[in-house]
């Protein structure tokens, strides 16, 4: 058993049929010794007597909260939530797998650029008896600070018959240089408790790994007297890291109809401009991505051809 | 410790072009490590992030663009002296931080390349034969580092009377080479800067 | 599947036109660029022009500006290279080719042969 | 026009061993640059798109890299189909223009 937080406790439980659970010894936070009574949430059923209660936890009927009370009065509260470990590992029932990029990934961050800004986000089908904390740090071992906000719901879904809620969380890295060269990876720690359940997600990533610019801006075309080319030239997103000659992107110029199955033009270039060939009913696309360390493109910027 | 603006001329800046294959020869070198030894630890989430110029050189403080020096995090107190003349520098106006910035690149290229050259003796002899350091990145370093063009003492090659360890010179290589590459990466900024200043 | 079928190789005079074509099987013709390149003997290869079937643009090689005409007909799924005021240095395979990505070629036909001698 | 210079023009390698070889653009072409084989009597055949992409069917012996103005085909360890004239082709812009192309032979 550990604290979560003041009067919030995790019980860690081997989840199998018949497992012994846990004897967890609850101490009334108090300076009175006798008279003391103990309940369970809004049951008024008397589960003991005394300064301490040893109950044994065993399954999620046991864990909820406790309290202590003398002559009617409530003296302390001890929340008590369940962490499971089935066949050795920890339970991720309350998160979604988003199997990007690979399987078992429940949190991805992202960010715009080097300022030691980024953006975490993960799904859940729940919708109730929710709640989330997010810490993150660089390294572990001693580790620098990073400053993650509130996670708030970012998104809801209709998959199918279900509704999939996003949640997201910002972080900045207290003293991030934006020219530094990564060693020490950073760390994102999730706690997640659905009702009584507690679950934990880790992230680590270095920040140049999850680099993904806004889309190029300002896209512009320019016809070609006595040619169907086109001139499209754009500027780098606003969320760029500067100055753009140490942080220089990369860009793919495609024409493509509304059909990803229809024929294109497809350009990559270092400038901020390039010529293509237009047609009818198609759209100029520009992404833009880091052009010396290859993580992720941008999503597209578009204008149509006409 | 800084790059100012007044650099050399657009097109007058040979290094560009080396560095530009230095980082395409890295990044290839690192893939085929990648591939061969899929066995071994070798991804970056595996490897430990070990920089064998830490303490050594300065690359990023020397090199940091003006733009940057503003913000404290970037401004770190080591200290290291340079030799200065190389041919990059191909303006007289050239200051005496940029000449820092490219001597510390050229330290850094020296140091890794006797590092690479000691571990691909070991390599060699490895009856597995399972992987060699490709020539053309040696070869791309050497280069970039004659157009750098710094007088330097020469590092002597370390030699090692013990029977090498293919296993840990293996997961040393995927180490190597993943801190070489980011360096790379920084170096190729660095010179795009200057080119573009 | 998708297939190019040239025409048979051909013989010409300096000074007269060659028009060659190109059936094409296997997806939707006008979903497709064709290209067409050449080949002198033991040489390298040369691009001439594309041509849009979907809606007739072309592009050709400056170098052959004014010199080709390439077509396409829809109905056939065939499309046609024409080289006008040939020169014996004109003598090459002429290869069509196709691909759904404008600037580079993925299906090649087998080629055909045009000689131009007096 | 962007010039392509594939080097060497004759590359003769021993069944096993491997090859590279390399093409230069007279000016930048970002990735834009396409691989080709071509075997005698043969129209040509796509191996490699925008540098470095492979293309399915392509055996992956065959890779390549490179950007800006210096790329590379290489051909991990030849195999004696792998005997061919290999191009290759810019598209960054019109018109498209092909190297002179290099003649894999057997040493």
């Known amino acids: 058993i550990w604290e979560l937080k003041k009067d919030v406790y995790v019980v860690e439980l081997d989840w199998y049929p018949d497992a012994p659970g846990e004897m967890v010894v609850l101490t009334c936070d108090t300076p009175e010794e006798d008279g003391i009574t103990w309940t369970l949430d809004q049951s008024s059923e008397v589960l003991g007597s005394g300064k301490t209660l040893t109950i044994q936890v065993k399954e999620f009927g046991d864990a909820g909260q406790y309290t202590c009370h003398k002559g009617g009065e409530v003296l302390s509260h001890s929340l008590l939530l369940l962490h499971k470990k089935e066949d050795g590992i920890w339970s991720t029932d309350i998160l979604k797998d988003q199997k990007e990029p690979k399987n078992k990934t429940f949190l991805r961050c992202e960010a715009k650029n080097y300022s030691g800004r980024f953006t975490c986000w993960w799904l859940t089908t729940i919708s109730t008896d929710l709640t989330f904390s997010v810490k993150s740090s660089r390294g572990s071992s001693d580790p620098q600070g990073v400053t993650c906000g509130a996670a708030t719901l970012s998104a809801e879904r209709v998959r199918g018959d279900n509704k999939e809620y996003e949640y997201s969380v910002e972080c900045q890295e207290d003293s991030a240089c934006p020219a530094a060269e990564e060693s020490l990876p950073i760390e994102v720690m999730v706690d997640a408790v659905h009702k009584l359940k507690y679950e934990n997600y880790t992230s680590s990533f270095f920040i140049r790994d999850i680099i993904k610019p806004d889309p190029p801006k300002n896209l512009q075309l320019k016809p070609l007297k006595n040619s169907r080319q086109v001139e499209v030239s754009w500027e780098y997103p606003d969320t760029w890291s500067t100055p753009h000659s140490y942080f220089s992107l990369t860009f793919c110029v495609q024409v493509q109809g509304k059909s990803k199955r229809e024929k294109k033009d497809r350009v990559f270039t270092d400038k901020t401009s390039a010529t293509v060939i237009c047609r009818k009913n198609a759209s100029i696309s520009v992404r833009a991505q880091d052009r010396y360390y290859s993580s992720s493109w941008s999503e597209w910027a578009s204008v149509p051809c006409s | 410790r800084n790059l100012p603006v007044a650099t050399p001329d657009p097109g007058m800046f040979p290094c560009l072009h080396h560095s530009q294959n230095l980082l395409r020869a890295v990044s290839n070198m690192l893939q085929k490590a990648r591939q061969t030894l899929e066995f071994y630890p070798c991804t970056s989430e595996e490897i430990d992030h070990e920089d064998i110029t830490k303490d050594k050189t300065s690359t990023v403080e020397a090199c940091l663009p003006l733009e940057l020096t503003k913000n404290e995090s970037c401004l770190n107190s080591r200290e290291t002296s340079f030799i200065t003349n190389g041919s990059c520098l191909a303006s007289r106006k050239t200051s005496f931080m940029m000449a820092l910035c490219l001597s510390s690149i050229y330290e850094d290229l020296k140091m890794y390349q006797v590092e690479f050259k000691t571990m691909n003796a070991k390599l060699l002899m490895d009856p597995k034969r399972q992987i060699f350091l490709d020539q053309n990145m040696l070869a791309v370093i050497d280069e970039l580092m004659q157009a750098l063009n710094f007088n330097s003492e020469t590092v002597p090659q370390k030699s090692s009377l013990e029977e090498p360890d293919f296993y840990k010179t293996k997961i040393k290589l995927c180490i190597l080479l993943h801190a070489f590459r980011i360096r790379a990466v920084t170096i190729d900024r660095v010179m795009s800067y200057l080119n573009a200043s | 599947q998708v297939q190019l079928v040239q025409s048979g190789a051909e013989v010409k005079k300096p000074g007269s036109s060659v028009k060659v074509s190109c059936k094409a099987s296997?997806?939707?013709?006008?979903?497709?660029?064709l290209h067409w390149s050449r080949q002198a003997p033991g040489q390298g290869l040369e691009w001439m022009g594309w041509?849009?079937?979907?809606?007739?643009?072309?592009e050709y090689a400056p170098k052959f500006q004014g010199r080709v005409t390439i077509t396409a007909d829809e109905s056939t799924s065939t499309a046609y290279m024409e080289l006008s005021s040939l020169r014996s240095e004109d003598t090459a395979v002429y290869y069509c080719?196709?691909?759904?990505?404008?600037?580079?070629?993925?299906?090649w036909g087998q080629g055909t042969l045009v000689t131009v001698s007096s | 026009d962007i010039v392509m210079t594939q080097s060497p023009l004759s590359l003769p390698v021993t069944p096993g061993e491997p090859a590279s070889i390399s093409c230069r653009a007279s000016?930048?072409?970002?990735?834009?640059l396409h691989w080709y084989q071509q075997k005698p009597g043969q129209a040509p055949r796509q191996l490699i798109a925008?540098?470095?992409q492979s293309i399915s069917g392509v055996p992956s012996r065959f890779s390549g890299s490179g950007s800006g103005t210096d790329f590379t085909l290489t051909i991990s360890s030849l195999q004696p189909e792998d005997f061919a004239t290999y191009y290759c082709?810019?598209?960054?812009?019109?018109?498209?223009?092909f190297g002179q192309g290099t003649k894999v032979e057997i040493k």
């Open positions: 082709q810019q598209s960054n812009s019109f018109p498209l223009t």
């Open positions: 000016q930048s072409i970002s990735i834009n």
């Open positions: 925008f540098a470095s």
């Open positions: 296997g997806g939707t013709f006008s979903d497709y660029y």
């Open positions: 080719a196709r691909n759904k990505e404008l600037r580079y070629i993925d299906v």
């Open positions: 041509i849009d079937p979907e809606n007739g643009d072309t």
